[in-house]
């Protein structure tokens, strides 16, 4: 039975040209995390594999940085980066847990950030 839950940064906003940390945290399970995938609606941003480390997709290599932790840092944000992001935790023996973050990239010089997420 899957008992875990994923906490995310939820809905966040950031300024065009700036950077943002996408963060998820899996709790309430003793399952082993074997891999975490970061995805947009139609493409893979990055994978963090427990054995093999990080793989950043070629299309994002110049502006995506791994971490902190299992999170992902998006840099040089553009308005086109607005949209849904998913953290997909592959675990054993539970299976797959998915978290959703909505990022809005704002043109204005004042971007209201959601509450900064802290890993417990």
């Amino acid at each position: 039975m899957m008992t875990g839950t994923i906490e995310t940064t939820g809905n966040i906003s950031a300024e065009k040209g700036g950077s943002i940390i996408l963060q998820c945290h899996l709790s309430s399970t003793t399952a082993q995390v074997t891999q975490v995938n970061w995805e947009q609606q139609d493409q893979l941003l990055a994978i963090c594999n427990a054995d093999l480390g990080w793989h950043i997709s070629p299309s994002f290599k110049d502006r995506v940085a791994p971490g902190p932790g299992l999170g992902l840092t998006l840099q040089s944000l553009t308005v086109n980066d607005t949209g849904e992001y998913f953290c997909i935790y592959h675990t054993y023996p539970d299976g797959t847990y998915t978290g959703r973050i909505f990022l809005e990239v704002l043109e204005s010089s004042v971007a209201e950030h959601g509450a900064r997420f802290q890993i417990p």
């Epitope: 093999l52 793989h55 070629p58 592959h90």
Partner: antibody
Framework: DVQLQESGPGLVKPSQTLSLTCTVS?????????WSWIRQPPGKGLEWIGY???????NYNPSLKSRVTISVDTSKNQFSLKLSSVTAADTAVYYC??????????????WGQGTSVTVSS | DIQMTQSPSSLSASVGDRVTITCRSS??????LAWYQQKPGKSPKLLIY???SRYSGVPDRFSGSGSGTDFTFTISSLQPEDFATYYC?????????FGGGTKLEIK
């Protein structure tokens, strides 16, 4: 340039253990690569067997997990495959390959030329 | 395990033709898909990774596209050396799995 070369017996008896070695040249085992085994039965497609990472972690195909061991000998620039309790269904060409995970994910960029293994009494 | 299905399983074409091979996964693999070329008696060669990125030294007549579960591999203008068998592979999650292959033959 990186080169991989498989070696081992071409004939193994049923119920015995198949043992293969892959020797890597033109490359040091100390850097961030993983090493994989793949096989191809005669006239058929490719099957991933498993990998060993630079940190000595292994990951095996569940269909073979109970019979497979992959290990590495960094001093010899070699990694090896052991497959126990073989049957005729294990007859295949066995390939070793390199995983540059940081750059290519689970796509394998350098392969050995393959070694043919027949399981027969 | 994620099943990979390639179509067609074989294909006849002529030098200069544009050829398209499709690969479908049984589950979502995002853009974690690779394409290999294999000639008889030889080992596979990596052509495309991450669905659309060409491996170093691969001619630009080879291209890949797609995401999710449906992928396409295209050779824009067939050359004599391109007649071979082509395999897709998902590298989204282990066990990494391959398609059954598409044999490209001379018409």
């Amino acid at each position: 340039d990186v080169q991989l070369q498989e070696s081992g017996p071409g004939l193994v008896k049923p119920s015995q253990t198949l043992s293969l070695t892959c020797t890597v040249s033109g490359h040091s085992f100390t850097s961030d690569y993983a090493w994989s085994w793949i096989r191809q039965p005669p006239g058929k497609g490719l099957e991933w067997i498993g990998y060993i990472s630079y940190s000595d972690s292994t990951n095996y195909n569940p269909s073979l997990k109970s019979r497979v061991t992959i290990s590495v000998d960094t001093s010899k620039n070699q990694f090896s495959l052991k497959l126990s309790s073989v049957t005729a269904a294990d007859t295949a060409v066995y390939y070793c390959a390199r995983l540059d995970y940081g750059n290519y994910g689970g796509a394998m960029d350098y392969w050995g030329q393959g070694t043919s293994v027949t399981v027969s009494s | 395990d994620i099943q990979m299905t390639q179509s067609p399983s074989s294909l006849s074409a002529s030098v200069g033709d544009r050829v398209t091979i499709t690969c479908r996964s049984s589950q979502h693999v995002s853009t974690a898909l690779a394409w290999y070329q294999q000639k008889p008696g030889k080992s596979p060669k990596l052509l495309i990774y991450s669905a659309s990125s060409r491996y170093s030294g691969v001619p630009d007549r080879f291209s890949g596209s797609g995401s999710g579960t449906d992928f396409t591999f295209t050779i824009s203008s067939l050359q004599p050396e391109d007649f071979a068998t082509y395999y897709c592979q998902q590298h989204y999650i282990t066990p990494w799995t391959f398609g059954g292959g598409t044999k490209l033959e001379i018409k």
